[in-house]
């Protein structure tokens, strides 16, 4: 019971973690900087892995795409795989793990395959989960490292004088968005290789009994089967084979519908 | 690295019209803002007209009725008409952007300039 519980719950938080993941990725305020001293319109910019958007204080948006690869910094094109290797991978797992769940019964579909589908599907959500985290960070101190470079730079370019614009700036959205279900998915893929160790079918029942004949310490007796069974004169279950048969973990438990020996 | 192109300016008789254009390249994600300011001999630079990216607009005080500002955000174009002119809008023209270059990297560009001599 415990174990379905862990699996599902594993299951429930790295579907919200991949769902976070996926929202992270395709949001645009991963970065945002409020522009000001502007003769014309307050204006508030904010940028995503995909597209460049500003907004004025009318309400006025415009959103441009990056249509350019090779323009891009290597950075953020680092991130995007990052976050778009995180996406697969999660989806990938998601689909696995439901075969995996123990509370879906698909045909005759032994523990064995279900402990492994759930260890498989925990090791993606965890890496998911870890690609996702690093993509947010590699970003977040892309913006710092960009900060502190940009501070105060004022150079001549070719066409006039180009000075960097101090703005206030913050994280956007996204990134707080992308670390949390990061966090949820690595969460979750942990819990379902935690389940996975409940599910695994225990050892063999079939136990190796040695028989240990030493001379001096086990007595043969007539009608030894029977009072051994409790058939015969022993009726008080003493134990006769003093020596003799033993599990290799010395005592055997509980017999068990597998113990046929 | 952001590139300012202005084209337009001359000499000009006093009533007469002129048309300033400024085209921007290089690296650009966006240009919030577009306007011209100008400066002449002995004075302050001071804004002459601007207008952002969903064409609002604002004019100084010397210029307004006169001056048309407009943008062509397709091809990161601003354009300035120029009418009525008079011989106290001589001065040196410059084309200013605000130019969002890189992922949290906003720069401010100014033109070289273009003379206007109204005389």
């Known amino acids: 019971m415990a174990v379905t519980a862990c699996q599902g719950l594993g299951f429930v938080v790295s579907l919200i973690g991949i769902a976070g993941i996926i929202a992270a990725t395709c949001m645009d305020q991963w970065s945002t900087q409020d522009l000001y001293n502007n003769p014309v319109t307050a204006v508030f910019n904010y940028q995503g892995l995909w597209r460049s958007c500003v907004r004025e204080s009318s309400g006025f948006t415009e959103c441009r795409g990056y249509f350019t690869l090779l323009g891009l910094p290597a950075m953020l094109q680092a991130v995007r795989a990052l976050m778009i290797v995180g996406i697969v991978l999660g989806a990938i797992g998601l689909l696995v793990s439901i075969f995996a769940l123990k509370c879906i019964r698909i045909g005759s579909m032994e523990d064995s395959a279900k402990a492994n589908m759930t260890l498989t599907s925990g090791i993606m959500f965890i890496v998911s989960g870890l690609c996702a985290i690093a993509g947010v960070s590699v970003f977040a101190n892309m913006l710092v490292t960009n900060f502190w470079m940009s501070t105060a730079n004022m150079y001549t370019g070719m066409g006039g004088m180009v000075q960097t614009v101090q703005t206030r700036y913050t994280f956007g959205a996204a990134l707080f968005v992308g670390w949390v279900a990061g966090g949820l998915t690595l969460i979750g893929g942990v819990m379902m290789c935690i389940a996975c160790r409940g599910l695994a079918p225990e050892e063999t029942n079939y136990k190796a009994v040695s028989y240990h004949a030493s001379g001096h310490s086990v007595a043969y007796k007539p009608g030894g089967f029977k009072a051994s069974t409790g058939f015969g004169s022993n009726t008080k279950n003493k134990k006769i084979y003093d020596g003799g048969a033993r599990t290799e973990d010395e005592v055997q438990s509980y017999p068990s519908k597998h113990d046929y020996v | 690295q952001v590139q300012l192109q202005e084209s337009g300016g001359g000499l000009v008789q006093p009533g007469g019209s002129l048309r300033l254009s400024c085209a921007a390249s290089?690296?650009?994600?966006?240009?919030?803002?577009m306007g011209w300011y100008r400066q002449a001999p002995g004075k302050q630079r001071e804004l002459v007209a601007g207008?952002?990216?969903?064409?609002?607009?604002n004019y100084g005080d010397s210029v307004k009725g006169r001056f048309t500002i407009s943008r062509d955000n397709a091809k990161n174009t601003v354009y300035l008409q120029m009418n009525s002119l008079k011989p106290e809008d001589t001065a040196v023209y410059y084309c200013?952007?605000?130019?969002?270059?890189?992922?949290?990297?906003?720069?401010?560009?100014w033109g070289q300039g273009t003379l206007v001599t109204v005389s």
């Open positions: 207008i952002s990216t969903g064409g609002t607009t």
């Open positions: 290089g690296s650009i994600f966006n240009i919030p803002v």
């Open positions: 200013n952007v605000l130019v969002v270059s890189g992922i949290g990297s906003t720069l401010e560009v």
